[in-house]
């Protein structure tokens, strides 16, 4: 049987909602960029459905996405990164829905990594540091980071701090003594590119010292 939809399938397809969203990752693998798209409705029957990007490409008119389970994916050096491309959901040669998108406005950075917290006894503070692969990149170098931390027992009571550097100091007196904290960080493009928050880094856990009764300070 052909991989293309029969006429009846096409009529059914036109009744479905093929809304989709995409994000780009620039220089995600050396000089290669990636583009990932997925349907907003997880129940869409993706059999026979393909994604294609046309325009604002180098040396080619269009590129087809690879399908990886429920997502559609391209990794290539061929994005011009200037102007708008047309991204379409297709059945055979028929386009079901399309979006004109500038790939530099849907950038999702890579998640920060190597998050750690060091307690400085003399300074009575915690120095939070993390790393990002974007420091080495040509394009998406400037990021805003969101550091979120909470006392482990407070399920949804996250405190957020926005910063542009990869180092943050938390004052000991702002934290509860003898408590276990969870901390994590994510990034979003800032200046020159637009887009979405990265995935969260893996969480790091640290314990605050107990209060020293004689001085009223933490040990």
């Amino acid at each position: 049987e052909s991989g293309y939809a029969q006429n009846g399938d096409l009529e059914d397809a036109e009744l479905d909602d093929y809304s989709f969203s995409c994000y780009s990752q620039l220089e995600v693998n050396g000089s290669q960029h990636s583009l990932t798209c997925a349907f907003e409705d997880p129940d869409v029957n993706t059999t026979n459905l393909e994604f294609e990007i046309c325009g604002a490409l180098v040396e080619v008119k269009c590129l087809n996405f690879r399908k990886l389970q429920e997502i559609y994916f391209i990794e290539t050096k061929k994005f011009l990164l200037i102007g708008k491309s047309n991204i379409c959901v297709k059945v055979g040669e028929k386009s079901l829905t399309c979006k004109k998108i500038d790939l530099t406005t849907i950038v999702k950075p890579e998640a920060p990594f190597d998050l750690s917290v060091i307690y400085r006894e003399g300074a009575n503070d915690f120095v939070v540091t993390f790393n990002t692969s974007h420091l080495q990149k040509k394009y998406v170098k400037v990021l805003m980071h969101d550091v979120a931390y909470r006392q482990e027992k407070d399920e949804n009571k996250w405190t957020h701090v926005n910063l542009s550097s990869t180092k943050l100091t938390l004052l000991q007196r702002k934290l509860q003594p003898a408590a276990m904290y969870e901390i994590k960080v994510r990034s979003i493009p800032d200046h020159y590119f637009k887009g979405f928050w990265s995935e969260w880094s893996p969480s790091y856990y640290f314990r605050t010292p107990e209060i020293n009764n004689s001085s009223g300070e933490m040990d």
Epitope: G55, L81, I82, G83, N86, K100, D102, T104
Partner: nanobody
């Protein structure tokens, strides 16, 4: 109704420099790609340089790479083409274009003449 206006052209000696400007009255300028082209007498219009909406990404034709620089000022709705080490073959009418959508430029200016004398 004029939406793109080029300026800065003129007569210059070989080896000299010129800076072209293109002012846009299009409301979406700050989110649009911009490009520069030229048309030499009796020849087709050729692409020279393009710049993304924020100025972070630029692209040049081999014929001008290293000599021409494209830049933009989104606060002034203006794109520039700095042209150095000009040659007689750079003579022509220079056009700016705005909003590159699926390989088609949506808006064009009327052009400004550049003549390089040897």
């Amino acid at each position: 109704e004029v939406q793109l206006v080029e300026s800065g052209g003129g007569l210059v000696q070989a080896g000299g420099s010129l800076r072209l400007s293109c002012e846009s009255s299009i409301s979406t300028f700050s989110s649009d790609a911009m490009g520069w082209f030229r048309q030499a007498p009796g020849k087709e219009r050729e692409f020279l340089a393009a710049i993304g909406w924020s100025g972070a990404v630029t692209h040049y034709s081999d014929s001008v790479k290293g000599r021409f620089t494209i830049s933009r000022d989104n606060a002034k709705n203006t794109v520039y083409l700095q042209m150095n080490s000009l040659k007689s073959e750079d003579t022509g009418r220079y056009y700016c274009a705005e909003d590159y959508v699926t390989d088609v430029w949506q808006y064009w200016g009327q052009g400004t003449q550049v003549t390089v004398s040897s």
